[in-house]
Amino acid sequence: AGIPEKAFNLTWISTDFKTILEWQPKPTNYTYTVQISDRSRNWKNKCFSTTDTECDLTDEIVKDVTWAYEAKVLSVPRRNSVHGDGDQLVIHGEEPPFTNAPKFLPYRDTNLGQPVIQQFEQDGRKLNVVVKDSLTLVRKNGTFLTLRQVFGKDLGYIITYRKGSSTGKKTNITNTNEFSIDVEEGVSYCFFVQAMIFSRKTNQNSPGSSTVCTEQWKSFLGE
C-alpha cells in the first residue's frame, strides 16, 4: 500500500466560530483522521477515516472559545487494521504519520462575518441605525449566543455614512449595536458598517456590510 503522505498546508477556515480545518493533498490508498485536543489535553478523533481534505471542528471549538486548540491530521493506511480507542489511533502498534495544525484560539482567530444593517428608527431629527446581532454556534445552557453575548464590549462597529447625494463621508465607532446621528429632514443617508474586535492586534475587522440608504429602507418597508 506504500507509506501514506503527510498532510500539508493545514489551514483553519473560520467565520463567527463556524470552523473547518482544511489541508492537502487528496489521499490515495490511505485515509485521514483528525484529532483535536480538549481542555483536559485529551485527543479526540474527528472525521474518522475520511478521504476528504477538510474537517468541521465547530462542535469542538465552541465548547470554550477562549481555549487554544491543538489539532493534527493523521494519514492512515487504508488496508491496515486500525483501532480507534477514543483518544488514540494505533496501527499495528505504531502511531501513523501526522502533521500538526497551527494552534487555534477561536476568540482571537475566527473571522468576523459580514454585518447586516437591521433597521433605521427615526425620532425627529435623530436617526438611529441598528446593526443585527447575529447568532453564533456558541451555546450556553442549550441556547445559541449572539456575537455580542460572546464578545461583550470587545465587539464594536465602524459606521461610515454620507448624505445620499454627497461623496463626503463621516465615520464613527460604537461598542453597541446602535448608533444615532443628527439628520436633516427630507434627506437620504447611506450607511456602511464593519464589525471589529477592539482587543485584536490582527484580523480585527469584518468585511463591510452592504450599503443601505434610508430611501431604500422606506421603499423596502413599503412606505
Partner: antibody
Framework: QVQLVQSGAEVKKPGSSVKVSCKAP????????ISWVRQAPGQGLEWMGR????????NYAQKFQGRVTITADKSTSTAYMELSSLRSEDTAVYYC???????????WGQGTLVTVSS | AIQLTQSPSSLSASVGDRVTITCRAS??????LAWYQQKPGKAPKLLIY???ILESGVPSRFSGSGSGTDFTLTISSLQPEDFATYYC?????????FGGGTKVEIK
C-alpha cells in the same frame, strides 16, 4: 422544527438553465451546510453539491462540476441551486436538505420538480 | 467515490413481519452511515444516523447496526405506515452517496 421551503415547479427547454431556491428560517441558517439532492422519476437519490453560507465554501459532485452553481444569500436565509445546459435527463425532483451535526440530512425541503422538454 | 450497494432492491412483507435491509460500502466508512424512509411524492425522512442512532421521534421498531463496510436496517415488526422505500447514505467523505434503495411492499 426547521422548515425548508423551495420554489415552485419549472418547465424548461433543453440547453437552458434553471435556478431553484430554498428558504430556511432565520437564525443559524448561515452556519449549516445546505446540500442539493436530486431524484429522477422512479430513480434513487443523487447528491449534487453543498454550500456553507457563512464560509462561502461550496463544492460539487464531479458529475455536475461546471454545470451546477450553488449560492446562498445570508440576508434572506436562502440557498440557490442553478443548473445550466439542461438536458432531458435532468428532469427530476430537486431537494435542498440541511446537513446535521455531521453530513446526514436532518431536514429536507418539499422538493421542486424540474421538467426539461422541448 | 464511495459506492453503496443495497439489498434487496425490493421485498414483499406482511404487517408484523421482521424486515432486514443491508447496505454494503465499497470501502471502510467507520460508522458514518444514515438510513432514510421515503414515501411516494414526499421528501426522504431521516431514521438513523451514525449507523445505529435513532433520530428523535422515530419509532423504536427501527434499528440500525454495523460499521466499516456492512450495515443493516431492521424493522422489528412491520406496521402499515412502514411500506415505503428505504435508502442508506454514507457521510464519511464527499461526494456524499446513497444506496440504490429498497422498496418494501405489502405481500
Amino acid at each position: 422544527q426547521v422548515q425548508l421551503v423551495q420554489s415552485g415547479a419549472e418547465v424548461k427547454k433543453p440547453g437552458s438553465s434553471v435556478k431553484v431556491s430554498c428558504k430556511a428560517p432565520r437564525g443559524t441558517f448561515s452556519y449549516y451546510t445546505i446540500s442539493w439532492v436530486r431524484q429522477a422519476p422512479g430513480q434513487g437519490l443523487e447528491w449534487m453539491g453543498r454550500i456553507i453560507p457563512i464560509l462561502g465554501v461550496a463544492n460539487y459532485a464531479q458529475k455536475f462540476q461546471g454545470r451546477v452553481t450553488i449560492t446562498a444569500d445570508k440576508s434572506t436565509s436562502t440557498a440557490y441551486m442553478e443548473l445550466s445546459s439542461l438536458r432531458s435527463e435532468d428532469t427530476a425532483v430537486y431537494y435542498c436538505a440541511r446537513e446535521g451535526d455531521r453530513r446526514y440530512f436532518d431536514y429536507w425541503g418539499q422538493g421542486t420538480l424540474v421538467t426539461v422538454s422541448s | 467515490a464511495i459506492q453503496l450497494t443495497q439489498s434487496p432492491s425490493s421485498l414483499s412483507a406482511s404487517v408484523g413481519d421482521r424486515v432486514t435491509i443491508t447496505c454494503r460500502a465499497s470501502q471502510d466508512i467507520s460508522s458514518a452511515l444514515a438510513w432514510y424512509q421515503q414515501k411516494p411524492g414526499k421528501a426522504p425522512k431521516l431514521l438513523i444516523y451514525d449507523a445505529s442512532i435513532l433520530e428523535s421521534g422515530v419509532p423504536s421498531r427501527f434499528s440500525g447496526s454495523g460499521s466499516g463496510t456492512d450495515f443493516t436496517l431492521t424493522i422489528s415488526s412491520l406496521q402499515p405506515e412502514d411500506f415505503a422505500t428505504y435508502y442508506c447514505q454514507q457521510f464519511n467523505s464527499y461526494p456524499l452517496t446513497f444506496g440504490g434503495g429498497t422498496k418494501v411492499e405489502i405481500k
